[in-house]
Amino acid sequence: TLNSVLNSNAIKNLPPPLGGAAGHPGSAVSAAPGILYPGGNKYQTIDNYQPYPCAEDEECGTDEYCASPTRGGDAGVQICLACRKRRKRCMRHAMCCPGNYCKNGICVSSDQNNFRGEIEETITESFGNDHSTLDGYSRRTTLSSKMYHSKGQEGSVCLRSSDCATGLCCARHFWSKICKPVLKEGQVCTKHRRKGSHGLEIFQRCYCGEGLSCRIQKDHHQASNSSRLHTCQRH
């Protein structure tokens, strides 16, 4: 079957199923029997989804988080909101812009000496895998006895890309998030139609490596809009 190749960052030049972009939460998805598509999967049910723009933080862009747009509004209606800058109020890390984290309800700078030391309570070599927290408290508990934690290797559970070793990013993998390789030149990449449009991706590819961008492959310009092949190409 194509299961493994469609799930791997290591495979080059495969056409991206469903045009490389998945549907929004609540949209219909389909998959050919036995074939695992980024936008739909015979093993997945989406019964928890509401027909709204996002359900979890990782469905939004890196500078966004998922929340109700109005204070005290309907908890079911969630959209991707702009991240909060330093010194702004927060309830969880994902609300804070990259380079910051949520501490005592305020977004603060995640410099090497504090955030890196906030490792999971058990000092395990795996990290939490979902950006969403429902209790409003920050995800991790400070343990001052161990201030540094080795970076996750490929296949390690992670919380965000900074948990992963160099050359890896933290990407969704079914109900978890794991460290996966940053894409190399010529590898298939996922070009989202807009930021946060990967609501139904059951796995995510990493982004393209330094000096590369995700663009339509030249010989695929004639293809229909829904089947254009995106690969990592030199700027």
Epitope: L36, Y43, E56, T122, G155, S176
Partner: antibody, heavy 115, light 108 residues
Framework: QVQLVESGGGLVQPGGSLRLSCAAS????????MTWVRQAPGKGLEWVSG????????YYADSVKGRFTISRDNSKNTLYLQMNSLRAEDTAVYYC????????WGQGTLVTVSS | DIVLTQSPATLSLSPGERATLSCRAS???????LAWYQQKPGQAPRLLIY???NRATGVPARFSGSGSGTDFTLTISSLEPEDFAVYYC?????????FGQGTKVEIK
């Protein structure tokens, strides 16, 4: 320390229902995807279902799809497996475990489906 | 589905000996999304290795994992009495998640 404690197993007739619970402690529960795995007597391990930290993503093995429902209550730090239309072949010890590779496991709860 | 075949089915060794357990996947995993577990009678499994070669927390250094593609190996450099158990491999590249049938390491 991380602890997972399953409950709710027992003897049920074919076609019957059971709801398993898994009480979690010692870690920030809603950060973690959770997994159910089962083991028939004297047999190997079989993946049953998985759910993301917020509960928005759920996945099932073909053998249980449409009969079993995985869910979680993050306010109670509890994972559930609702099992309907049970069959003799569902007889097994059911384990809850943390993450997609199972870094912590509960002690298991035995489900026996027999008439 | 990816089928994982473990060999040998049973390994009879003495304490202090080296144990080499094999796990072969029916298709290339391409990525090191493979874990190893130890299970003793009447107990839940215990994670030993994830990401093909990363030791889990609290696992002794005598356990090591290696391999890529379709062939993976768990090595126990010098068997201790508590290491006699059943060992399972598991892939988490694709769904359904699948386990090998297990290798029993028994005292010779």
């Amino acid at each position: 320390q991380v602890q997972l404690v399953e409950s709710g197993g027992g003897l049920v007739q074919p076609g019957g229902s059971l709801r398993l619970s898994c009480a979690a402690s010692g870690f920030t529960f809603n950060n973690y995807g959770m997994t159910w795995v089962r083991q028939a007597p004297g047999k190997g391990l079989e993946w049953v279902s998985g759910i993301s930290g917020s509960g928005s993503y759920t996945y099932y093995a073909d053998s249980v799809k449409g009969r079993f429902t995985i869910s979680r209550d993050n306010s109670k730090n509890t994972l559930y497996l609702q099992m309907n239309s049970l069959r003799a072949e569902d007889t097994a010890v059911y384990y809850c475990a943390r993450t997609i590779y199972m870094d912590y496991w509960g002690q298991g709860t035995l489900v026996t489906v027999s008439s | 589905d990816i089928v994982l075949t473990q060999s040998p089915a049973t390994l009879s060794l003495s304490p202090g000996e080296r144990a080499t357990l094999s796990c072969r996947a029916s298709q290339n995993l391409f990525s090191p999304y493979l874990a190893w577990y130890q299970q003793k009678p009447g107990q839940a499994p215990r994670l030993l290795i994830y990401g093909a070669s990363n030791r889990a927390t609290g696992v002794p250094a005598r356990f090591s994992g290696s391999g890529s593609g379709t062939d993976f190996t768990l090595t126990i450099s010098s068997l201790e009495p508590e290491d006699f158990a059943v060992y399972y491999c598991q892939q988490y590249l694709t769904l359904p998640l699948t386990f090998g049938q297990g290798t029993k390491v028994e005292i010779k």
